[in-house]
């Protein structure tokens, strides 16, 4: 049964150039997380962080990618191009797969904020 | 290239206890978790059990709990299917299978060891 | 359990066509199914996971779609090759269940 919730960072925006912190939280449920996903619209995959091997962060991503805080995911240099979906996965036991999906928007505009609905510390 | 070799299967009285092996060639074991998967002589597939990367983390269904154990040894590019208690209907086909490193599915099979359960 | 319904078990075609293969999940389970092919003395091989991505090294040819209980599988221009066994399994919650099949056979 599966009775967790996923709370995310929700509707984000951040400047060009700058960076952004990805999270996810996942609560309701005492399953346990053995790993958890980051992808991006198109399906690719940033990142891995799996309980017993850590962080993978696939190559592409290797340069502007950066593991946390926690289970999150920190975006740097951002382009206009990551503009976009952006999907967590958590894997659990014996729940499953939960999804938590973040909109990120990257603004030329140097009044861009980064806006969060939570923080986990 | 990406092999897995079951090994082990027979024939086995009710009640008996039967040890399972699957050797693993061509990819970096210890990075991939991996699963157990048998087909029944109807031709049905059912997940049997799953062990981590590490091997901290088994699961199994209901059908196989406390009857099955999980295990491998990462050293050895070995896994195991450890059954007890075995019954008619655990007669099939064994297959073991590799995770993809996202978790998503199995993306590599063996071609399986045959278990037959009868007296 | 997530129960999943396959259909049609058996199905008859010829090479050139196209044909589609379904499974209904007993509830949703998001867009985790995949599918794989059996083919008598070689390996299971994953085709499609997450409902729609395709299996690296699989010809485009084979497409998935579907999310919540709904799933097809779609094999264009049918190739000699192809005529298998073929399986969904869904990846969304423990246990890890499997549709009964569909036997795909030269009409």
């Known amino acids: 049964m599966m009775t967790g919730t996923i709370e995310t960072t929700g509707n984000i925006s951040a400047k060009k150039g700058g960076s952004v912190i990805l999270q996810c939280h996942l609560s309701s449920t005492m399953a346990q997380v053995t790993q958890v996903n980051w992808e991006q619209h198109d399906h690719s995959l940033l990142a891995i962080r799996n309980a017993e091997l850590g962080w993978h962060i696939y190559p592409a991503f290797k340069d502007r990618v950066a593991p946390g805080p926690g289970l999150g995911l920190t975006l740097q240099s951002l382009t206009m191009n990551d503009t976009g979906e952006y999907f967590c996965t958590y894997h659990t036991y014996p729940d499953g797969t939960y999804r938590g999906r973040i909109f990120l928007e990257v603004l030329e505009s140097s009044v861009a904020e980064h806006s969060a609905r939570f923080q986990i510390p | 290239e990406v092999q897995l070799v079951e090994s082990g299967g027979g024939l086995v009285k009710p009640g008996g206890s039967l040890k399972l092996s699957c050797a693993a060639s061509?990819?970096?074991?210890?990075?991939?978790?991996m699963s157990w998967v048998r087909q029944s002589p109807e031709k049905r597939l059912e997940w049997v059990a799953e062990?981590?990367?590490?091997?901290?983390?088994?699961y199994y269904p209901d059908t196989v709990t406390g009857r099955f154990t999980i295990s491998r040894d990462n050293a050895k590019n070995t896994l195991y299917l450890e059954m007890s208690s075995l019954r008619s209907e655990d007669t099939a086909m064994y297959y073991c299978?590799?995770?993809?490193?996202?978790?998503?599915?199995?993306?590599?099979w063996g071609q399986g060891t045959s278990v037959t359960v009868s007296s | 359990d997530v129960q999943i319904t396959q259909s049609p078990s058996y199905l008859a075609a010829s090479p050139g066509e196209t044909i589609t293969i379904n499974c209904r999940a007993s509830?949703?389970?998001?867009?985790?199914l995949a599918w794989y092919q059996e083919k008598p003395g070689k390996t299971n091989k994953l085709l499609i996971y997450?409902?729609?991505t395709l299996q690296s090294g699989i010809p485009s040819r084979f497409s998935g779609s579907g999310s919540g209980t709904d799933f097809t599988l779609t094999i264009s221009s049918l190739e000699p090759e192809d005529f298998a066994m073929y399986y969904c399994?869904?990846?969304?919650?423990?246990?890890?269940?499997f549709g009964g099949g569909t036997k795909l056979e030269i009409k």
């Open positions: 509830k949703s389970i998001s867009k985790y």
């Open positions: 299978a590799r995770k993809r490193r996202d978790y998503y599915a199995m993306d590599y």
């Open positions: 062990i981590s990367s590490g091997g901290s983390y088994t």
């Open positions: 997450s409902g729609s």
């Open positions: 399994q869904q990846h969304n919650e423990y246990p890890w269940t």
């Open positions: 061509g990819f970096t074991f210890s990075s991939y978790a």
